[in-house]
């Protein structure tokens, strides 16, 4: 028998990691803090109107490693740090904007020769 | 196998201070949160906080700020809980307990404290 | 904070019938992004501590017996004890692992007649 408080070893589980959220908060999320079982992200891009925003939150384990890869989108500007190490992480995780291309300032329909 | 090894019992006197002890064995202690559960005779279960002891973030009950303060010692793979300014409302079963995903996985035998002058 | 509602308080059964005790949550417990339900269910025998016996919301923990069925989804969850044994006589609680504060039900204690 058992004694109380003695159990078989655990099986393996993904430890809950805290993230802070910002823009992107999950309708589990608490004072600003979501709970997954993957990454904390931060994330900057330009809005429709050229502005940086900041998101902040969690990315869950299925996907996580594609959507980490900062791969570049054609006709955004944006950018994806990631972390694991700590709980709140991605407090101190301060991507910037890739720099603007010739190509990014071309307006609409106009092209320059 | 995994254990939670806690006192049995704890007496100490009103105002007083008390600091509560949880020693685990047979996992990885970083591996897993640590969290704390009161529960009063012939009562229900009350959450207090947890912490992870890889880098002792803890999340607390608001009801137990300030009441209660939770550490890890990760040399002797040790959790504590100290409770402060102590009244009868205090005294209860402390469990501790482990989670990866915030339902518990295991739990100590658990401490009766016992505030009485 | 979640609030969760266990009834009945208590109730006495005879060895090898059916036992169906109810916990109902104050919010959602599924979560949109996984479809899980962040629901558990503890047996506490007399003078002893809490067991896991399902988590969310019918996955049943290692070792616990089959005749455990969890159920439910949303706000409401169901305990089932298919064939009553003896020493399936304790208090039965239900807890939310959906954020934090994590908060249990009042508990059903399981009498035997």
């Known amino acids: 028998k058992k004694e109380d408080g003695e159990s078989t070893a655990p099986t393996a589980r993904p430890k809950v990691l805290r993230c802070k959220c910002h823009h992107h908060c999950p309708e589990d999320s608490v004072n600003n803090i979501c709970s997954t079982d993957g990454y904390c992200f931060t994330m900057i891009e330009e809005d429709d109107s050229g502005t940086p925003v900041v998101t902040s939150g969690c990315l869950g384990l299925e996907g996580s490693d594609f959507q980490c890869r900062d791969t570049p989108i054609p006709h955004q500007r944006r950018s994806i740090e990631c972390c694991t190490e700590r709980n709140e992480c991605n407090k101190d995780l301060h991507p910037t904007l890739p720099p603007l291309k010739d190509r990014d300032f071309v307006d609409g329909p106009i092209h320059h020769k | 196998q995994v254990q939670l090894q806690q006192p049995g019992a704890e007496l100490v006197k009103p105002g007083a201070s008390v600091k509560l002890s949880c020693k685990a064995s047979g996992y990885t202690f970083t591996s897993y949160w640590m969290h704390w559960v009161k529960q009063r005779p012939g009562q229900g279960l009350e959450w207090i906080g947890d912490i992870d002891p890889s880098d002792r973030y803890t999340n607390y009950n608001q009801k137990f700020k300030g009441k209660a303060t939770l550490t890890v010692d990760t040399t002797s793979s040790t959790a504590y809980m100290q409770l402060s300014s102590l009244t009868s409302e205090d005294s209860a079963v402390y469990y501790c307990a482990i989670s990866g995903w915030d339902y518990f996985d295991y739990w100590g035998q658990g401490t009766t404290l016992t505030v009485s002058s | 904070d979640i609030v969760m509602t266990q009834s009945p308080s208590s109730l006495a059964m005879s060895v090898g019938q059916k036992v169906t005790m109810s916990c109902k949550s104050s919010?959602?417990?599924?979560?949109?992004?996984?479809?899980?339900?962040?629901l558990a269910w503890y047996q506490q025998k007399p003078g002893q501590s809490p067991k896991l016996l399902v988590y969310?919301?019918?996955t049943r923990e290692s070792g616990v017996p089959d005749r455990f069925i969890g159920s439910g989804s949303g706000t409401d969850f169901t305990l089932t004890i298919s064939s009553v044994q003896a020493e399936d006589l304790a208090d039965y609680f239900c807890q939310q692992h959906y954020n934090i504060p994590l908060t249990f039900g009042a508990g059903t204690k399981l009498e035997l007649k």
């Open positions: 969310f919301a019918s």
């Open positions: 919010q959602s417990l599924l979560k949109s992004s996984n479809q899980k339900n962040y």
